[in-house]
């Protein structure tokens, strides 16, 4: 169970403040109720902090990236864990601060220099044809916001929906994530029943658009609940 | 500018439901999370629900579990809040907001006002037995 995970000693890289030898400047504190450390914006205390069960990595805040608290641990415990400085070991983009992606199991930089051409070919030289994952849990494609000059075409490599042009999103592609168009009203759309099952899709479709929300199709109402058709309709 | 618009209070009785909304405008929403917050005459303002920038996670404070439920709408700048079951007790003015992704979030995060950078002016619900 998480507790079991959370209470042993195996936790290795938890975000501040469990995790202060992850790196982040200020960020190791003792653990002493009270002590104020950094929880977004603002300040939070230790005494009451809790780790975040995940299921994904977009689940968690910016350096942060979602695994298994132990080490080669059970898949089925997830919680945010904090980023992975330059040169350190990785496994996907994700686990890499931001500013620095995965090559060659190493986090490298990614700065100006670095276009959009090289983190393709990173893309698909760490992840090429072999898709088994070491770990249990889904390579993403994360790359820094400030690598992007111009908002992302249909297609294009992204981090987040904000990164693409107006009408598309950015949505999970086999094992990276790129611009896909908003759905439109009657399209097909993903209704998740189960928190956390998005994280295995790996043809993520976008959200319907605005106006629109993703519901059972009226003559679908009948079917069951396996082959139930869910479209994009209005509010 | 940016603004947080909620509409959809009213009055109603025991039992009875309403849909709250809450539209946002003048910057992109998707990596912020959004969240209900209410505050009663007399009493503080309380956490009521939240959902998170990735849309899977919602989050809702014990007395509104099983009645209440948050929803953002595909373009993620629109929040929704299905109140069912209601009671005089959730009688309050009820307050959109908006926080940003953190660097790390813990299972407080969401309930933290301290954390949400953008609020509405509010909507009274008003609900009598």
């Known amino acids: 169970t998480l507790n079991s995970v959370l209470n042993s000693n195996a936790i290795k890289n938890l975000p501040p403040p469990l995790g202060g030898a992850a790196g982040h400047p200020g960020s190791a504190v003792s653990a002493a109720p009270g002590i104020l450390y950094p929880g977004g914006n603002k300040y939070q205390t230790i005494d009451n902090y809790q780790p975040y069960p995940c299921a994904e990595d977009e689940e968690c805040g910016t350096d942060e990236y979602c695994a298994s608290p132990t080490r080669g641990g059970d898949a089925g415990v997830q919680i945010c864990l904090a980023c992975r400085k330059r040169r350190k070991r990785c496994m996907r983009h994700a686990m890499c601060c931001p500013g620095n992606y995965c090559k060659n199991g190493i986090c490298v930089s990614s700065d100006q220099n670095h276009f959009r051409g090289e983190i393709e070919e990173t893309i698909t030289e760490s992840f090429g044809n072999d898709h088994s994952t070491l770990d249990g849990y889904s390579r993403r494609t994360t790359l820094s916001s400030k690598m992007y000059h111009t908002k992302g075409q249909e297609g294009s490599v992204c981090l987040r929906s904000s990164d693409c042009a107006s009408g598309l999103c950015c949505a999970r592609h086999f094992w990276s994530k790129i611009c896909k168009p908003v759905l439109k009203e009657g399209q097909v759309c993903t209704k998740h029943r189960r928190k956390g099952s998005h994280g295995l899709e790996i043809f993520q479709r976008c959200y319907c658009g605005e106006g629109l929300s993703c519901r059972i199709q009226k003559d679908h109402h009948q079917a069951s609940n396996s082959s139930r058709l869910h479209t994009c309709q209005r509010h | 500018e940016v603004q947080l618009v909620e509409s959809g209070g009213g009055s109603v009785q025991a039992g009875g439901s309403l849909r709250l909304s809450c539209t946002a405008s003048g910057r992109p929403f998707d990596d912020y999370a959004m969240a209900w917050f209410r505050q009663a005459p007399g009493k503080e303002r309380e956490f009521v629900a939240a959902?998170?920038?990735?849309?899977?996670?919602?989050h809702y404070a014990d007395s509104v579990k099983g009645r209440f439920t948050i929803s953002r709408d595909g373009a993620k700048n629109t929040a929704f809040m299905q109140m069912s079951s209601l009671k005089p007790e959730d009688t309050a003015v009820y307050y959109c907001?908006?926080?940003?992704?953190?660097?790390?979030?813990?299972?407080?995060?969401?309930?933290?006002?301290?954390?949400?950078?953008?609020w509405g002016q509010g909507t009274q619900v008003t609900v009598s037995s």
């Open positions: 959902i998170s920038w990735s849309l899977s996670r919602t």
């Open positions: 907001a908006a926080a940003p992704r953190p660097k790390w979030v813990s299972v407080q995060y969401f309930s933290t006002s301290a954390n949400y950078e953008y």
